[in-house]
Interface confidence: low
Amino acid sequence: MMTGTIETTGNISAEKGGSIILQCHLSSTTAQVTQVNWEQQDQLLAICNADLGWHISPSFKDRVAPGPGLGLTLQSLTVNDTGEYFCIYHTYPDGTYTGRIFLEVLESSVAEHGARFQIP
């Protein structure tokens, strides 16, 4: 039975050219996290494997940095980075938990750098 909950940074916004940290946190379960995948729509951005460590997709190596923790830092943001991001926690014995973050990259300086955690 899956009892865990994924908490995420929710809907966030950032300025073009800036950076943003995508964060997810798995709580309310004692399941072991074996791997976390970060995906943008249908693209795999990065993997953090409990045994092997981080792997960043070569397409994003210039703009994606691992961490902090199991999070992901996006740098040199462009308007094209606007969209849904997913953290996919592979756990044993529970299975897979998925969290969703929506990032909006704004041209102007009105972006709010929210760091709140929301449960979707």
């Epitope: 795999l44 993997i47 494997n49 092997l52 460590g53 981080w54 792997h55 960043i56 070569p58």
Partner: nanobody, 119 residues
Framework: EVQLVESGGGLVQPGGSLRLSCAAS????????MGWFRQATGKEREWVAS???????WYADSVKGRFTISADNSKNTAYLQMNSLKPEDTAVYYC?????????????WGQGTLVTVSS
């Protein structure tokens, strides 16, 4: 130190196929991803494809649907199956490993194998 040896290059007609191999030896216990890159004459080296131990694969847009990367962990060998080859695929192809070191960059390089696509 890891040593990488590529093979399988050659001359092929447009639309043809080739299979490149990359054999790794040395301190291979920290090899967690293998990648293929290429460098055409007068151009910068560009990433082509990579495979993570466990099977995840990535491809450059220019080769998606035509190239397939794979790895045989038991043989410490990576492969690049290249189909529907085009003249613009002509280049020296290099394999490299990603070790999850501090840099996250591919290193070291093999000596390369030349692929020529021409009629």
């Amino acid at each position: 130190e890891v040593q990488l040896v590529e093979s399988g290059g050659g001359l092929v007609q447009p639309g043809g196929s080739l299979r490149l191999s990359c054999a790794a030896s040395g301190s291979i216990d920290r090899i967690n991803a293998m990648g293929w890159f290429r460098q055409a004459t007068g151009k910068e080296r560009e990433w082509v494809a990579s495979v993570l131990r466990g099977g995840y694969t990535w491809y450059a847009d220019s080769v998606k649907g035509r190239f397939t990367i794979s790895a045989d962990n038991s043989k410490n060998t990576a492969y690049l199956q290249m189909n529907s080859l085009k003249p613009e695929d002509t280049a020296v192809y290099y394999c490299a490993r990603d070790s999850y070191s501090t840099s996250f960059w591919f290193d070291p390089w093999g000596q390369g194998t030349l692929v020529t696509v021409s009629s």
